[in-house]
Amino acid sequence: EPPTACREKQYLINSQCCSLCQPGQKLVSDCTEFTETECLPCGESEFLDTWNRETHCHQHKYCDPNLGLRVQQKGTSETDTICTCEEGWHCTSEACESCVLHRSCSPGFGVKQIATGVSDTICEPCPVGFFSNVSSAFEKCHPWTSCETKDLVVQQAGTNKTDVVCGPQDRLR
């Protein structure tokens, strides 16, 4: 990387190195030969998360309930607010600027991974021996009933959407 004129946490202004403002503070005035850099703390609902020479702090993110958002972590003078989605919803992007309803897995599919505030439901097709007869954001594929363990026989084969139907064994006369 190219050489720098100043130390870490300094910046060059008027051929002189001045201290940057620490996180949580903004620049009021550059240093001079006789005075240090003047910084001021960010106001309520504002933040700066790096050593900086910004003259304005950034506004904390607003978690808009109309978009399904709620506060996951309140912002400080050094950190932004972190939003997440209401129960049953998830973020549409990493920045979590809006939410969408968790997808449900259709009959014949089960939930492989339950949705979180930041990821959607992951569905998987029910393999042979398993079924799902509901549209759900929580239900996994269920195993077919084992007729044998109930001393019954299969009267109707199962599918990926239906369980087997068990019935009594035919008695030998």
Partner: antibody
């Protein structure tokens, strides 16, 4: 008391590399930038660059960019300076020198060297 | 880069003499200047920093002055142990640069 002890003299062929060490004691190694300064025989002082032992950040003089690497091992309070593709005009005494404490400086870089290593003579000759 | 020009390059003086060495920067460096003394085969020794502040343990016969581009190191009464080479160094911005040195010799 503060001490900077450097590795011994080296003789290298042109095109080779040299790595000089500087072991610090008597103070908090991560609290002060470490600089490297060289002095060719009968010549003046030439600044090569610095390393911040706390962050590992470095800053090299343009002249040495791409040829010098400064590193540190905080577990043994030692700074290193490696110079590659040596030429005969790299023959010099290489010094490590301790800067003022981190956070001491508010205006200017105010890099003044209150403690120096004893110097390491690097001779580049075919 | 900031060029530092020292003068004279050498000076012959006697014990008890007042010796003045000047250092000029190619651009303003405020008061960010240091002076070092170096004896043959030894590392430099910090005498003065921020143009006029005496480093701890340095005799008071050494003094520094100046700001901007013109600086002076004065030895008020030269002692036998003061025969050495003196360097100025700007500490305003990187790259740090040194003057070419002034050798103080016995007359």
């Amino acid at each position: 008391q503060v001490q900077l002890v450097q590795s011994g003299a080296e003789v290298k062929k042109p095109g080779a590399s040299v790595k000089v060490s500087c072991k610090a004691s008597g103070y908090t190694f991560t609290g002060y930038y470490m600089h490297w300064v060289r002095q060719a025989p009968g010549q003046g002082l030439e600044w090569m660059g610095w390393i911040n032992p706390d962050s590992g950040g470095t800053n090299y003089a343009q002249k040495f960019q791409g040829r010098v690497t400064m590193t540190r091992d905080t577990s043994i309070s030692t700074a290193y300076m490696e110079l590659n593709r040596l030429r005969s005009d790299d023959t010099a005494v290489y010094y490590c020198a301790r800067d003022q404490p981190l956070g001491y400086c508010t205006n200017g870089v105010c890099s003044y060297f209150d403690y120096w290593g004893q110097g390491t003579l690097v001779t580049v000759s075919s | 880069d900031i060029q530092m020009t020292q003068s004279p390059s050498s000076v012959s003086a006697s014990v008890g003499d007042r010796v003045t060495i000047t250092c000029r920067a190619s651009q303003g460096i405020y008061s960010w200047l240091a002076w070092y003394q170096q004896k043959p085969g030894k590392a430099p020794n910090l005498l003065i920093y921020t143009a006029s502040t005496l480093q701890s343990g340095v005799p008071s016969r050494f003094s520094g002055s100046g700001s901007g581009t013109d600086f002076t190191l004065t030895i008020s009464s030269l002692q036998p142990e003061d025969f050495a080479t003196y360097y100025c160094q700007q500490a305003n911005i990187f790259p740090l640069t040194f003057g070419g040195g002034t050798k103080v010799e016995i007359k």
